[in-house]
């Protein structure tokens, strides 16, 4: 082209993919008449006529630009719509009169890439790898021109470093003409990189200037050998018998090594392997004092078969032994005295207290309980509680029953029982004493005796109500070596006037059941008249 060497640099027009490029023909009036212009695209130094302007009217030439060109600004500007990366080339306008002159425009096309997609090595990286290993990949899709990638570790850009850091990038051209950038970061990592944050950044240019997009941050699994092994016990703090105790082995390596937990045999002083669960945890449930002792953990690297031993750890399962009370089965005469002594062993200091079983009333704080001038009512249960105050819930108890010698003592002296004639009556009589009494009845019937506790007995009698029985009533007699005592049950016939609205209430001790002599399946309930219970 004549005079091309003297031509100024082309005017730069920058647009984003998909937008409209405005190509303004910069010929001055002296250089040419803008009502008569030819537009060319230049690709690989080949000019192609794409548009003609004649008398201010535009006409596209057949070809790739045919549908996308139009005139604007009274013919001085050519508008190119739907710009693609393939449009990045030189466009020139050529005026025909008074003499052939041309004006060149360099169209630059831009497209921001998509967010960079980072993928971390899912298998992890050993610290002892012989050469840099693949840490992560970064993909930036559909950018133009090719974006630049920068890799970061803990916020600092990574530079190529021989045998330490290697960044390998490549790009592919999509059918759209856009570029997809792929980059892989290879690095030799160290143990401290287990918490390192890696990300990639894409740097690209748009008409508005330079921009960048960052990927999310990732951490890479780093594998490093175990250097230290230790034991951890849960729960922390003082342990007691009955607790669920977990002993686990921990190591500072990744992946964790294979573990075994051993306990020192106190007699042989040899370490004996304990059975752990599938997670390698030794579970003591319930913990017993025999579990106390010295534990240690051994860790093996299965690849090298090198083993490491933890510091031994003393485990103390606190306990309270069975509580012993002396005398174990005390018997005393009324009016006498008694000293109860409580003993127990423990891994910690013990506190004792005595309680009355029936009322839970605290009688004494200390191992010795002294009772004086014993009454019959003093008979019954006394409980010694041995506890460790520093370990809540660690205690043992022992119950002792005190027996006071004495003749039988009746639950009631006399009682009225409402009955119907010909019914089978179920009568109860209760007595206590030491030695335990036996009960006899003054009428024939089916009697059965139940021992309620060492000093108390309950006898029940099934008897048919007859006129004679109504006349005499029923007596129960309790006897032991020290005497006898009697309770009387007066039988009274039920009639309609006797029954009151609440007459179906149960008496508690005596119930009467209908017999075949009366209506089948009917029941009648004895009614006891309210009266104070008598004793003795």
């Amino acid at each position: 082209v004549p005079g091309e060497a003297e031509q100024p640099a082309p005017e730069l027009v920058e647009v984003e993919v998909g937008s409209t490029a405005l190509l303004k023909c910069g010929l001055s009036q002296s250089q040419g008449n803008l009502s008569h212009v030819d537009w060319f695209s230049v690709h690989k130094e080949k000019r192609t006529l794409i548009f003609r302007v004649r008398q201010g009217q535009g006409q596209s030439e057949p070809g790739e630009y045919e549908q996308r060109l139009s005139l604007q600004d009274r013919g001085a500007t050519l508008a190119l719509t739907q710009v693609t990366p393939q449009d990045e080339r030189i466009f020139l306008c050529q005026g025909k009169r008074p003499r052939s002159q041309e004006y060149r425009i360099q169209l630059r096309v831009y497209k921001a890439p998509e967010e960079p997609n980072i993928q971390v090595n899912p298998l992890g990286i050993p610290v002892n790898s012989k050469e840099p290993e693949e840490v992560a990949t970064c993909v930036g899709r559909n950018g133009y021109p090719i974006p630049q990638v920068i890799w970061y570790k803990n916020g600092r850009p990574l530079k190529e470093e021989k045998n330490r850091v290697h960044i390998q990038s490549s790009q592919t051209v999509e059918s759209s003409g856009l570029y997809t950038l792929q980059s892989i970061l290879k690095a030799q990592l160290v143990k401290e990189d287990k918490d390192a944050q890696f990300y990639c950044e894409l740097n690209y240019r748009l008409p508005s200037g330079n921009h960048m997009k960052e990927s999310r941050e990732v951490t890479v699994p780093v594998f490093y050998p175990t250097e230290k092994v230790w034991l951890e016990v849960e729960p922390v703090g003082m342990l007691k018998e009955g607790d669920r105790v977990e002993i686990r082995c921990l190591a500072d390596g990744n992946p964790p090594p294979h573990f075994s937990i051993s306990k020192q045999n106190p007699s042989t002083r040899e370490a004996e392997e304990e059975t752990t669960n599938d997670n390698g945890v030794l579970v003591l449930e319930p913990a017993r004092k025999e579990h106390s002792g010295r534990y240690e953990c051994q860790a093996w690297n299965l690849d090298t078969m090198i083993s490491l031993l933890s510091e031994p750890q003393e485990l103390l399962v606190n306990y309270v032994s069975d509580v012993r009370v002396s005398p174990a089965a005390p018997e005393r005469q009324e009016g006498s005295s008694l000293t109860l002594t409580c003993e127990a062993e423990s891994s910690q200091d013990l506190e004792f207290q005595w309680l009355r079983e029936e009322t839970d009333q605290v009688l004494e704080r200390g191992p010795v309980l002294q009772l004086h001038d014993l009454k019959r009512e003093a008979g019954g249960g006394y409980r010694c509680v041995a506890s460790v105050p520093s370990i809540p819930g660690l205690n043992r108890t022992q119950l002792v029953k005190l027996a006071i010698f004495g003749p039988p003592w009746m639950a009631f002296k006399e009682r009225k029982v409402w009955v119907k004639e010909n019914m089978v009556l179920n009568l109860s009589c209760e007595a206590s004493g030491h030695p335990r009494p036996t009960i006899s009845w003054n009428v024939n019937g089916t009697a059965s005796e139940q021992d309620q506790d060492p000093q108390r007995v309950l006898s029940t009698l099934n008897v048919l109500v007859t006129p004679e029985l109504l006349e005499t009533g029923v007596e129960c007699t309790a006897s032991n070596d020290l005497g006898k005592n009697t309770s009387i049950l007066f039988l009274e016939l039920v009639n309609l006037t006797t029954l009151t609205p609440d007459s179906n209430t149960t008496t508690g001790l005596s119930t009467s059941t209908a017999s075949p002599h009366t209506r089948a399946n009917s029941t009648s309930t004895e009614r006891k008249l309210p009266e104070p219970e008598s004793r003795g």
Epitope: P122, E134, V139
Partner: antibody, heavy 118, light 106 residues
Framework: QVTLKESGPVLVKPTETLTLTCTVS????????VSWVRQPPGKALEWIAA???????YYNSAFKSRLTISRDTSKSQVVLTMTNMDPVDTATYYC????????????WGQGTLVTVSS | DIQMTQSPSSLSASVGDRVTINCKAS??????LAWYQQKPGKAPKVLIF???SLQTGIPSRFSGSGSGTDFTLTISSLQPEDFATYYC????????FGQGTKLEIK
């Protein structure tokens, strides 16, 4: 073009050791990692082991103590050995190439069916 | 280990149908997921990687979506050659595959 081809015995006895070879072409073992994946008849795929382009070896922890993966870059071969074979190890064994810029498998061998039976 | 659960396990459809196959991860895997197609007696073939990127040479009727724990493979218009078993695979931590979805002709 990229190809991978598995070879090895079609039948092994219980307790024996299986040795499979994957011969690759169209790429270098120092530029792409290779994995072994197996598929019992009528069942799903299961990843077994991998060797990276840098030579680091990885194993599925379910089989770790029974597996060894190695490579001979000069022969373009990756070898998998699996000890103490059991009838439940009957499967089609595939070797697959890991895509250079990703972590998925872009090329697979045709697979070899290994039957474990006495 | 991360578990991958596919649904449904089998599916009947006709040529021209739009089909979706789901895959659920037991924990967040971001977009570290690939989809494979396997025909009887053949090796698996990758269709989608990074949850939504179409592998070179795979027809555009295949598409992938989702991130985190829930993912979908969609075939916009079934072709006769698409009847096969489809597997999802996570590569966020180790490699695990779903149990497969068998796509059959109705």
């Amino acid at each position: 073009q990229v190809t991978l081809k598995e070879s090895g015995p079609v039948l092994v006895k219980p307790t024996e050791t299986l040795t499979l070879t994957c011969t690759v072409s169209g790429f270098s073992l120092t530029s792409s990692g290779v994995s072994w994946v197996r598929q019992p008849p009528g069942k799903a795929l299961e990843w077994i082991a991998a060797i990276s382009s840098g030579g680091t070896t990885y194993y599925n922890s379910a089989f770790k103590s029974r597996l060894t993966i190695s490579r001979d870059t000069s022969k373009s071969q990756v070898v998998l050995t699996m000890t103490n074979m059991d009838p439940v190890d009957t499967a089609t064994y595939y070797c697959a190439r890991r895509y250079g810029y990703g972590w998925y498998f872009d090329f697979w061998g045709q697979g070899t069916l290994v039957t474990v039976s006495s | 280990d991360i578990q991958m659960t596919q649904s449904p396990s089998s599916l009947s459809a006709s040529v021209g149908d739009r089909v979706t196959i789901n895959c659920k991860a037991s924990q967040n895997i971001y977009n570290s997921l690939a989809w494979y197609q396997q025909k009887p007696g053949k090796a698996p073939k990758v269709l989608i990687f990074n949850a939504n990127s179409l592998q070179t040479g795979i027809p555009s009727r295949f598409s992938g979506s989702g991130s985190g724990t829930d993912f979908t493979l969609t075939i916009s218009s079934l072709q006769p050659e698409d009847f096969a078993t489809y597997y999802c695979q996570q590569f966020y931590s180790g490699y695990t595959f779903g149990q497969g979805t068998k796509l059959e002709i109705k």
